[in-house]
């Protein structure tokens, strides 16, 4: 049985200051190390305890990093992406895509499958509309009594 996972996808600019032990996270992905099927993007695989990213608190394991200091991370070899981070300087600006899972299904590990899903608003808008129609109908019914 195939499950379905829906995601709320948001983007955020995260500015980190390199700490004594660096930025404090690990990455997976790249054209030679696809982490998500049909996606050679760069993903955060581990946030290190007490590192700069952990202390900042915004970067999360599973986030996709779109750019570093304005430089796009598309179509990079894994090691080239690593080197880009290592040479990014003291102040590092990350453009990050967060994926908030809003519904669980019987699927495999997130990141090792298909990340596609439907945005939450596509679920919430029809539900909200139905609720409003039902409320309106109920009020009309009460007025007729």
């Amino acid at each position: 049985m195939n499950g379905r996972v829906d995601y709320l996808v948001t983007e955020e600019e995260i500015n980190l200051t390199r700490g004594p032990s660096g930025l404090g996270f690990n990455i997976v992905g790249g054209t030679d190390q696809q982490y998500v099927s049909n996606d050679s993007g760069i993903y955060v695989s581990r946030i290190k305890e007490n590192g700069a990213a952990a202390l900042d608190g915004r970067l999360q394991e599973g986030d996709k990093i779109l750019s570093v200091n304005g430089q796009d991370l598309k179509n990079l070899l894994h090691q080239d992406a690593v080197d880009l981070f290592r040479n990014a300087g003291y102040a590092v600006s990350l453009r990050v895509q967060h994926r908030l899972q809003v519904q669980n299904g019987p699927i495999g590990h997130r990141g090792e499958g298909d990340p596609s899903g439907i945005p939450i608003f596509m679920v919430l808008v029809p539900v909200f509309a139905l609720t409003m129609v039902a409320a309106w109908a109920f009020m009309r019914y009460r007025q007729q009594l």
Epitope: L23, F25, N26, I27, V28, R46, H78, E112
Partner: nanobody
Framework: EVQLVESGGGLVQAGDSLRLSCVAS????????MGWFRQAPGKERDFVAA????????YYEDSVKGRFTISRDNAKNTVYLQMNSLKPEDTAVYYC?????????????????????WGQGTQVTVS
Amino acid sequence: EVQLVESGGGLVQAGDSLRLSCVASGRTFSYYGMGWFRQAPGKERDFVAAISWSGGSTYYEDSVKGRFTISRDNAKNTVYLQMNSLKPEDTAVYYCAGAFGSTVDNYDHSDPREYDSWGQGTQVTVS
């Protein structure tokens, strides 16, 4: 995280060889940088060798260079440590360790804190 199980330890004579294996399960092995550490009784856990996710880079502790070889087979989810010309001072519990992904910081492969998954260890005794 990945689960790691070591095997291949045992009791050997000085000058003999052993090959340790570490089998991984639970997550895609090829995303992991792998390392071997050892701990002698009453001592700290020390770095022995490490290998990058692709196998393209290897690192060794000075005292084992030329005697030990780390390798991996991503198709078999296994990392190996070939130990030749064993010495009594190689006696220890040998641990396999995995680091999920590549650090974006300067990589210190000898730092146990770089690794997030550990095996239970296998005893190597050289008499």
